[in-house]
Interface confidence: low
Amino acid sequence: DTHKSEIAHRFKDLGEEHFKGLVLIAFSQYLQQCPFDEHVKLVNELTEFAKTCVADESHAGCEKSLHTLFGDELCKVASLRETYGDMADCCEKQEPERNECFLSHKDDSPDLPKLKPDPNTLCDEFKADEKKFWGKYLYEIARRHPYFYAPELLYYANKYNGVFQECCQAEDKGACLLPKIETMREKVLASSARQRLRCASIQKFGERALKAWSVARLSQKFPKAEFVEVTKLVTDLTKVHKECCHGDLLECADDRADLAKYICDNQDTISSKLKECCDKPLLEKSHCIAEVEKDAIPENLPPLTADFAEDKDVCKNYQEAKDAFLGSFLYEYSRRHPEYAVSVLLRLAKEYEATLEECCAKDDPHACYSTVFDKLKHLVDEPQNLIKQNCDQFEKLGEYGFQNALIVRYTRKVPQVSTPTLVEVSRSLGKVGTRCCTKPESERMPCTEDYLSLILNRLCVLHEKTPVSEKVTKCCTESLVNRRPCFSALTPDETYVPKAFDEKLFTFHADICTLPDTEKQIKKQTALVELLKHKPKATEEQLKTVMENFVAFVDKCCAADDKEACFAVEGPKLVVSTQTALA
C-alpha cells in the first residue's frame, strides 16, 4: 500500500480539518514552549504544501517522508536553541535519528502556567472565532501532555467546543460551563495517563507488553469474539498506539479510523454492545468503541482447568508455540473474568508461564502443573485484601485525610523523591478512593488496580527524568505488571538521612488566604512531606499536632485585619512550636 506522496495520501484520507488538527497537536507536543501563533504558521505552511501535493503528487518534495517534512518545519523555528537548548542539536541529525531525538526531548512536566477557566473571556474568544478556539484547546492540552492520544484529543476538542456552544448562550455562563469543564478535565487527565502508560509500556518493555495488556482488555470487553479475532484487533491496535507514541499522528489517526471501520463491519463476531457506537460519526465512534461496556460472557464455557491444567499435552502445546499458547491462556482467563483487573490477569499469565517453565522440565510435568490454579489464587487474594483495607481507611478518613495518610506512607517509603512529585502522586492515589471504593464489588478491582498503574507510571516517568531513589528505579523497571505490588511491598527507608529543618519551607504569606481550596490543600500537604523528610520517624500524634497548629495559624492570620503582619509575627512562632512538637 505504497503512495507516491505520503502527505497527499494522509491529507486525502483524513480531510483538511483533521489533518490540520493533528499537525497542530504534533507540533505542540514537540515544541511545548512555542506560542500558539507560531504553531498556526507552521500548520498552515504544511497544510498548503499538502494541498499542493494532492493536486500534483510529483511536485518537488511531495515524495518526502512525513518525519522529514515535520522535522524540516520544526528545524525552521528561529528560536529553537534559545528556547529548547540542546534540542536544536537534533536538527543536525538525519531521519530516523532526528525524529528519535525530538521524541527524547518531550517533557512530561513542562513548566507551563495552570489553565484557569474564566467563563466570560472564554465565551468571548469562542464567539469571536470557533475554529481558533478549537485549535487553541488542542494546543494547550497537547503541549502539557506530549504523549496525548492525538485522535482522541480531536474528540475532546469537539466536545469542548460543544460545551461552549451550549453554555455561552446560557444566562449564567459560569454555572453552566465550570462543572462541565471540570468533568471534562478529569476525563482528559485520565485519557492522558492511559496513553502515557501505553507509550511507556512500548518504550520500556517493548510492544509485546502492550499486546499482552490489550489481549486481556479486549478479551474482557469482547468475550464472545474468538481468539483469532482478538489477536487481529490487538495487532491493529498495537500498530495504532505505536504510531501515536512515535509521533506519527497522521498514520495513527488514519489507522485508528480503519480499525473502527473494521470493528463495526464485523461487530456480529465481536460484540453485541457495539451497535450504538457504530451508528456514530468517526471521532465519536472510535471513542465509544474504546469505552464500550463489556459484553456478556458466553454461556457454557468449559472450565479453564480442562485445557490448561488437566490436559496431559499442556507442555507439548506450550513448547510448540509459547506465545500463542500463553496468549490463549490470557484470552480464556480474561474473557471469563471481567471482574479482574488487567494487571492482575497479566500477573496470572506470568505466574502460569513460570510454572510451565518449571514443570515442563520435570520428569512428571502433569503432576507438577495440575495444581497450578491453586498456586494462582494468591494473586487474586492479595489485591482484594489490599483494596478492602484501603477502602476501609478511605471511608473512615475521607479523600483529603486518605491523601494525607498516603503522603505519610509514601514519603516514608521513598523520601528521596521530590516533594512536588510526592504530593502529586499521593493526591492522585488518594483520589482512587473516591473513584473506586464507591463502586460495586465486581468493578472495584479493575478500577483500583488499573488506576494505580496509571499513577505509578506517572511516578516512574517523573522519576526517570531525575532519578534519586534506587527503590523507585527497581520497582519501575523490573516488571511492568508487578509495579504496584513492588511499591506496596516497600517498607520505610531506614537508610535515609533526614533533611535539615528549613525555615523557608514553613514561611507563609497572605497570598495563601485567597488560594482556592485545592491549592490550600496542596500547600498543607507540601508542608507535611517536608516535615516527614525532616523527621521520618515522627509519630502520627506528632504529625497531627503540627498540622493542627499549621491550620490554626493559617486560619488566624487569614482572619486578621493586617494579614501580612500576622504571618510575619506568627510564622516564626509556628516554626518554634513545630520544632518543639517534633523534638
Epitope: 483538511e16 470557533e130 469537539n158 460543544g162 460519526p281 471521532l283
Partner: nanobody
Framework: EVQLLESGGGLVQPGGSLRLSCAAS????????VAWFRQAPGKEREFVAG????????YYADSVKGRFTISRDNSKNTLYLQMNSLRPEDTAVYYC???????????????????WGQGTLVTVSS
Amino acid sequence: EVQLLESGGGLVQPGGSLRLSCAASGRYIDETAVAWFRQAPGKEREFVAGIGGGVDITYYADSVKGRFTISRDNSKNTLYLQMNSLRPEDTAVYYCAARPGKPLITSKVADLYPYWGQGTLVTVSS
C-alpha cells in the same frame, strides 16, 4: 453555491413520527455544517438540531432532545431529521440550513447559515 430541498412534512397525530429529508446539491453535505430550524406561526425561527462539518458531532435543542435524531447519508448527499413522540408544540415549518467551509461544529444562530431550503410544514394535531 448550495441548493437544499426539504421533504417529508405532513399532518401527524400527537405521539406519532415523521422523517424529514433534505437533499443537497452543489456541494458535498459532509463538507458543511448543517442544521434544522423551525418557525411556528408568529414566532421566531428556532434551532432544532445540527451536525458539524467533517466531524459529525450532533447538537439538539433541549425541547427535542431524546425525541429527534439528526443524521446524514453522505452517499446520498442527504440530511435527515427523525422526529418521534411528536407534540402539538412541534407544529411549524421546518427548514434545512447549510454553512459551508467544513465548520467543526454547528451553530444555533440562524444568521450564520447562508443557505436555506424553502421549508416543509409539519402539523401535529388530533
